[in-house]
Amino acid sequence: ESLGTEQRVVGRAAEVPGPEPGQQEQLVFGSGDAVELSCPPPGGGPMGPTVWVKDGTGLVPSERVLVGPQRLQVLNASHEDSGAYSCRQRLTQRVLCHFSVRVTDAPSSGDDEDGEDEAEDTGVDTGAPYWTRPERMDKKLLAVPAANTVRFRCPAAGNPTPSISWLKNGREFRGEHRIGGIKLRHQQWSLVMESVVPSDRGNYTCVVENKFGSIRQTYTLDVLERSPHRPILQAGLPANQTAVLGSDVEFHCKVYSDAQPHIQWLKHVEVNGSKVGPDGTPYVTVLKTAGANTTDKELEVLSLHNVTFEDAGEYTCLAGNSIGFSHHSAWLVVLPAEEELVEADEAGSVYAG
């Protein structure tokens, strides 16, 4: 994750001395502050090469992120700079200093230079973490077409402000675990994975904890892959119709297709008393087909006005694309004007590859 997508006016600079190894310093800064984290060598001895890490990912120096062997500066701090920072020995990856940094909306006043008081006292009683919007976290299964982006959210609160970490299938999940990495937004309690692929499928758990307790939520991600197919026609359409002589009738056909579909409406006819030709293909007449100014929406409806007995019979919606054809058929029954309407049976469905 790149540090910093938010630059604000630089306020004060707050330099924070490093904690004893093994301790975690909880720090709060205002938006726009310059965050300075200091990690002197233990016992004042030589330190050797070090790396600064945020949320498990090594920090890359930039015009805004200044990395030194004993000091890290993040200018114009913003929400996205919140997270877990550590200074580690490059060779052993031993953690020398560890900081939990939170950047709040309001620029800090300058009174709490190290921000420790603010981290511990948010004005409410101390307590274990809790979900702030549980009613908006009901979606446990996320089915996402490949190449799109996923965002898991676990908005929480507590005092002291809890930390959030993520697991995939029960194991710690970090950016280096997937091609393309991950993006963490601690302020938004969220994990983002861009351009998902099938290997991203699994169970993702957010773990939110402070010293008073821990809560977790698990989401299941399914990455959907598409194989090309012939058009899909909505079940039950067109529906059988019974109409009174002289009335108007509409048949509907809903077509789903990746490749551009070609839609036709056909009426089955008899030729020399036969409904099918020598090869078994039905005799049909084309009632409606795509024209220069015909939209797909218009093609999905066949309108028959002032129906006669000759209009009775079988009608077919035929849809084809570069993969193949599908068709559904329905029957029209025309009754004399004085007879009551009688519902016909449901339409049958036929597919052709």
Epitope: E6, R133, K139, K140, A146, T149, R151, P155, E225
Partner: antibody, heavy 127, light 107 residues
């Protein structure tokens, strides 16, 4: 490299029709979508509609609903904007843009992001 | 429809200046907001999505923040190529709607 190229623009009389094409390369439609956005001369951007390839669904701005139709032929990696009953106020540069979704667990909504755009094609509706 | 209102409509600035553009939605759009940059005669380019995510390849001097109804695009140190018109756009509601644009001109 992702590229989108629009074509089919031109001069058309009020009430007339025009079909714009958007040829894509460097990606396939099957999991993402194509949006159309227009910009009248000297004005801001206006979203026209979107084709979502996964389910073949389309969405339109109220100003074009019933007149414009978006479709796609994934075998040709091309999207189309069929414009009927054109009016003078439809005069604009029309852009197509690759569109992907951000699927969110929060409230189960999808945010649509237009990340690659074509160069645009000018449609002029005038008598 | 959700109305998006940008301010200012235009501004004059010099190279190296820090520039802030705001965008206000007529109703809550959570973080479903993108920022685009457009130069005359050219197509728009995506800068920021989901309110604060920097799109790949976009310089880190661009940043976005906000959620709900109030959003900000910040350019920390204006460069010559940044003189353009900037648009915000929401996509949580239907239809997707753009702000009217903010033109950043050379002082």
């Amino acid at each position: 490299e992702v590229q989108l190229v629009e074509s089919g623009g031109g001069l058309v009389q009020p009430g007339g029709s025009l079909r714009l094409s958007c040829a894509a390369s460097g990606f396939t439609f099957t999991s993402t979508g194509i949006s159309w956005v227009r910009q009248a001369p000297g004005k801001g951007l206006e979203w026209v509609g979107r084709y979502w390839a996964w389910d073949g669904s389309t969405n339109y701005a109220d100003s074009v609903k019933g007149r414009f139709t978006i479709s796609a032929d994934t075998s040709k990696n091309t999207a189309y904007l069929q414009m009927n009953s054109l009016r003078a106020e439809d005069t604009a540069v029309y852009y197509c843009a690759r569109t992907y979704g951000i699927y969110d667990t929060y409230d189960n909504y999808t945010e649509y992001v237009m990340d690659y755009w074509g160069q645009g094609t000018l449609v002029t509706v005038s008598s | 429809d959700i109305q998006m209102t940008q301010s200012p409509s235009s501004l004059s600035a010099s190279v190296g200046d820090r520039v802030t553009i705001t965008c206000r939605a007529s109703q809550d759009v959570d973080t479903s907001l993108a920022w685009y940059k457009q130069k005359p005669g050219k197509a728009p380019k995506l800068l920021i999505y989901s309110a604060s995510f920097l799109y790949s390849g976009v310089p880190s001097r661009f940043s976005g923040s906000g959620s709900g109804t109030d959003f900000t695009l910040t350019i920390s140190s204006l460069q010559p190529e940044d003189f353009a018109t900037y648009y915000c756009q929401q996509s949580t509601g239907h239809p997707q709607t753009f702000g009217q644009g903010t033109k950043v001109e050379i002082k």
